[in-house]
Interface confidence: medium
């Protein structure tokens, strides 16, 4: 510059910001500073209006900082960094150009301690890492968990236990067994749990006397066939102890049989009462069982007539049936039982006959809503008491009539009454009276033909003394009803003592025994009770199917109307407590007061008038 | 902090069956509940452990039968019911925080069960 | 199941003293063995799992030691609050047992 000259770069803004200015002899130049570029595009410039402009490092070549980095323009340079997974040799960032120049290497996450779980495996890659469970360890959010191959993976073989440890798990074969590797403990399918056969392994196991068995895990010490000594198992040598000869009978026949024994044999004869399963009578094998006989099946008349049978293991136990009793006369020997009619029925005959009843012998049936009804069967009760206290005392039939009135004559309490209590309380009251009818011509009390009558109950009762032909019949009336026996009778219902027959005819009783106890099968019909209730009894074993009818005459409360049929119908204990059936009579002639009803048995009969079976309604 | 806070002392009759509870709090119930029983004479027993998260239980085959393991995810509370309960089962029972590596990190109290008739 | 075999049942000593337990395992629990400290009114504390290492927050002074069957627990310098009853639990297979327990007492 010339003496006197002006410095034009002493003054800052001769040049714009980001370059520098250089003062010349006869003048200055701009020049922009590294990392800028001006925007005339000359490198030494003057003048007002050029600028020096930001220069984007990054932009001038693909990877300025090199593989695995970021570049980032900043003002005049570039910084470089590396990428996640990735470091300089010093750790940080650098200028681009600068001397410290690096280049951006892989990490190797895996020398940092705790960056995977407990029990897991590391594994670097290029800019990341990756943790794995060790083997016998799973993965459980974020943390390797033992796995327990016992649950999760068919791992040890049959006849061995799994046992699971942390990280792993061994096997052990079952006792008495051992693995085919030898070793105590094992893993995988590859070996097998095998029996040890000790008996090959040491033939002085079981001592010179005894034969050595192998069993699965074990062995045990037995003697010779046709030895013995109680069979044991073993640890070490057999006790001190010599096979003695075999009594085959100990414990070899089955049940229900006895064993013989013989020179180095035996035989199993099954009990009596019971019959070997091959049919053998004498048997040896040891599959054949000694089989229940079925007396009662085999002949059904094993207990003779009128008997139940029962078959019970090795026998069977003969019982009567209802109404009969053990003759002990004809029961002596076995196969003898005999069962004969009971004369008459006692309470506890009947208690047998209902639930209901024996609920009111409890004292708790008095109690539990039965009282009027048990309060009616006690009273019943009462009666048969007196017949039946002395079998042998006479009784007295007019004052049981009397008696059997004071029950009838609770009408009301009856009308209380459900229609079971009804049927089982009316049941009881027939066959209280007709026991009563038949002690009083079995035990009489003077007369035993008499004529008894009250205001519930009519009873006539004969006594057939003189010689009764058997053409000829006896007539017997109770109010206006009537009963006609054949003579025939006297021969078949086989009486002890003087036959005897008796009619009884109630009043009202029909009002309680109505037609809702008649099951009528056609439901279009009306029904009314169109008679009383009368029964009729003979003395001896038989009660039914005669060889001829018995004939009753049934007087007709009301007149019978044109429209209406007459059935005939008797008193049955063996549906439900007591119902009316039709079975076992038929209507001989229907006039409009009377039915004549003819019946092969003696009975409770009534008359039921049934109408409109026409018309349907 | 973790804390295991177990219910009060049980005196029981023979023949009946108690439930000891055991609250867990200052941490997620995730981890496996242990149970163990000391005795003077037997020292200290596992009786079994119990899974928070499913339920799954695991038991000492002496204390099958005898300890039922349940769990109320919603309270973060864990239950053992003793049944048939002899005065052999008097003891102190103790809930412990399993580690996935099967030990025991932190403890509760314990339950003192005097089993008299 | 493994049977863990503590010794000495007693152990007398004074503070400043070093003190050795050993558990004893009937088979090999690999380095599977925790140790335990139970005081009277506190809830017991673990010490030690996996043989060797040490639970966050238990002293230095405490040491395991051992693998396979045979294991230790050292107690270097010991202060007056480490007396009391020391129980070796194995965690290597199912059902978890204990050892019967040390007794440490203040001489």
């Known amino acids: 510059q010339t003496l006197g000259g002006v410095n034009e770069c002493q003054d800052t803004t001769t040049c714009p910001a980001y370059a520098t200015c250089t003062d010349t002899t006869d003048s200055y130049y701009c020049t922009c500073k590294r990392g800028f570029l001006s925007s005339n595009g000359q490198t030494n410039f003057q003048g007002p209006g050029v600028e020096c402009q930001d220069v984007n490092e990054c932009l001038q070549s693909d990877s300025p900082c090199g593989p695995n980095s970021v570049c980032t323009n900043i003002l005049g340079r570039a910084k470089c960094s590396c990428l996640r997974g990735f470091s300089s040799s010093t750790g940080k960032d650098w200028i681009l150009g600068s001397l410290d120049n690096f280049l951006c290497a892989d990490v190797d996450e895996c020398l940092t301690i705790g960056i995977c779980p407990k029990y897991s495996n590391c594994s670097n890659s290029v800019g990341s890492y990756s943790c794995t469970c060790q083997p016998g360890f799973v993965l459980n959010g974020s943390i390797c968990e033992d796995e327990d191959e016992c649950v999760t993976r068919d791992v040890c073989p049959e006849h061995a236990t799994c046992h699971n440890t942390l990280g792993s798990y061994y096997c052990t074969c079952n006792s008495g067994l051992e693995s085919s590797g030898g070793g105590p403990m094992f893993q995988g399918l590859d070996e097998s749990c095998e029996d040890v056969d000790e008996c090959s392994r040491n033939s002085t196991l079981c001592g010179p006397t005894f034969i050595c068995i192998n069993t699965l895990g074990s062995y045990s010490c037995s003697c010779p066939a046709g030895f013995s000594l109680p069979t044991f198992q073993i640890l070490g040598h057999p006790a001190d102890g010599n096979c003695t000869d075999i009594d085959e009978c100990d414990d070899t026949c089955p049940l229900n049989s006895s064993c013989t024994n013989t020179i180095g044999s035996y035989f199993c004869t099954c009990h009596p009462g019971f019959a070997s399963s091959n049919g053998q009578l004498n048997f040896k094998d040891l599959e054949v069982t000694c089989e229940d006989i079925d007396e009662c099946t085999q002949d059904p008349l094993q207990c003779g007539l009128n008997s139940v049978c029962t078959n019970v293991p090795g026998s069977y136990i003969c019982g009567c049936l209802p109404d009969f009793q053990m003759d002990p006369e004809g029961s002596q020997g076995y196969g003898n039982f005999n069962c004969k009619r009971i004369l008459f029925k006692c309470k506890e005959d009947l208690i047998l006959q209902s639930e209901q009843i024996q609920q009111c012998q409890a004292v708790q049936g008095r109690d539990l809503g039965y009282a009027s009804f048990c309060t009616l069967v006690n009273a019943t009760f009462t009666i048969l008491d007196n017949t039946c206290e002395n079998k042998s005392a006479p009784v007295s039939l007019q004052s049981a009539a009397t008696s059997v009135s004071l029950v009838l004559e609770q009408a009301t309490t009856w009308f209380e009454l459900s229609k079971e209590e009804t049927s089982t309380l009316g049941t009881i009251l027939l066959e209280t009276v007709e026991s009563t009818m038949l002690a009083a011509l079995l035990i009489p009390s003077g007369n035993a033909s008499q004529m008894i009558q009250t205001e519930y109950l009519d009873i006539e009762s004969k006594v057939i003394n003189e010689e009764c032909k058997e053409n000829e019949s006896i007539n017997l009336a109770a109010r206006g009803d009537k009963m006609n026996v054949g003579c025939f009778i006297i021969k078949e219902s086989v009486s002890t003592g003087a036959p005897g027959v008796a009619f009884v005819s109630f009043a009202h009783m029909e009002s309680v025994l109505n037609e809702r106890f008649f099951e009528d099968g056609q439901s279009f019909r009306k029904l009314r009770m169109n008679s009383r209730v009368v029964g009729g009894t003979v003395t001896g074993e038989k009660k039914e199917d005669f060889s001829k009818p018995i004939i009753y005459t049934l007087q007709h409360i009301q007149p019978k109307q044109k429209s209406e049929r007459p059935i005939c119908v008797s008193w049955n204990t063996d549906v439900e407590d007591g119902r009316w059936t039709p079975s076992g009579c038929e209507i001989v002639e229907a006039s409009e007061t009377h039915t004549v009803c003819s019946c092969n048995r003696m009975a409770n009969l009534a008359i039921i008038m049934a109408s409109g079976e026409l018309t349907m309604e | 902090q973790v804390q295991l806070q177990q219910s009060g002392a049980e005196l029981v009759k023979p023949g009946t069956s108690v439930k000891l509870s055991c609250k867990a709090s200052?941490?997620?119930?995730?981890?496996?509940m242990n149970w163990v029983k000391q005795t003077t004479g037997q020292g200290l027993e596992w009786i079994g452990r119990?899974?928070?998260?499913?339920?799954?239980?695991s038991y000492n085959v002496n204390f099958k039968g005898k300890a039922t393991l349940t769990v109320d995810e919603s309270s973060s509370t864990a239950f053992m019911q003793l049944s048939s309960l002899t005065p052999e089962d008097s003891a102190v029972y103790y809930c412990?925080?399993?580690?996935?590596?099967?030990?025991?990190?932190?403890w509760g109290p314990g339950t003192m069960v005097t089993v008299s008739g | 199941d493994v049977q863990m075999t503590q010794s000495p049942y007693n152990l007398v000593a004074s503070p400043g003293e070093s003190v050795s337990i050993n558990c004893k395992a009937s088979?090999?629990?690999?380095?599977?063995l925790a140790w335990y400290q139970q005081k009277p009114g506190k809830a017991n504390k673990l010490l030690i799992y996996e043989g060797s290492t040490l639970q966050s927050g238990i002293p230095s002074r405490f040491s395991g030691s051992g693998s396979g069957t045979d294991f230790t627990l050292t107690i270097r310098s010991l202060e007056p609050e480490d007396f009391g009853l020391y129980y070796c639990?194995?965690?290597?297979?199912?059902?978890?047992?204990f050892g019967s327990g040390t007794k440490l007492e203040i001489k």
């Open positions: 412990a925080r399993g580690d996935s590596y099967w030990y025991f990190d932190f």
């Open positions: 119990i899974n928070p998260g499913t339920g799954g239980t």
């Open positions: 639990q194995q965690h290597n297979e199912y059902p978890l047992t």
């Open positions: 200052g941490y997620t119930f995730t981890n496996h």
């Open positions: 088979k090999s629990i690999s380095k599977y």
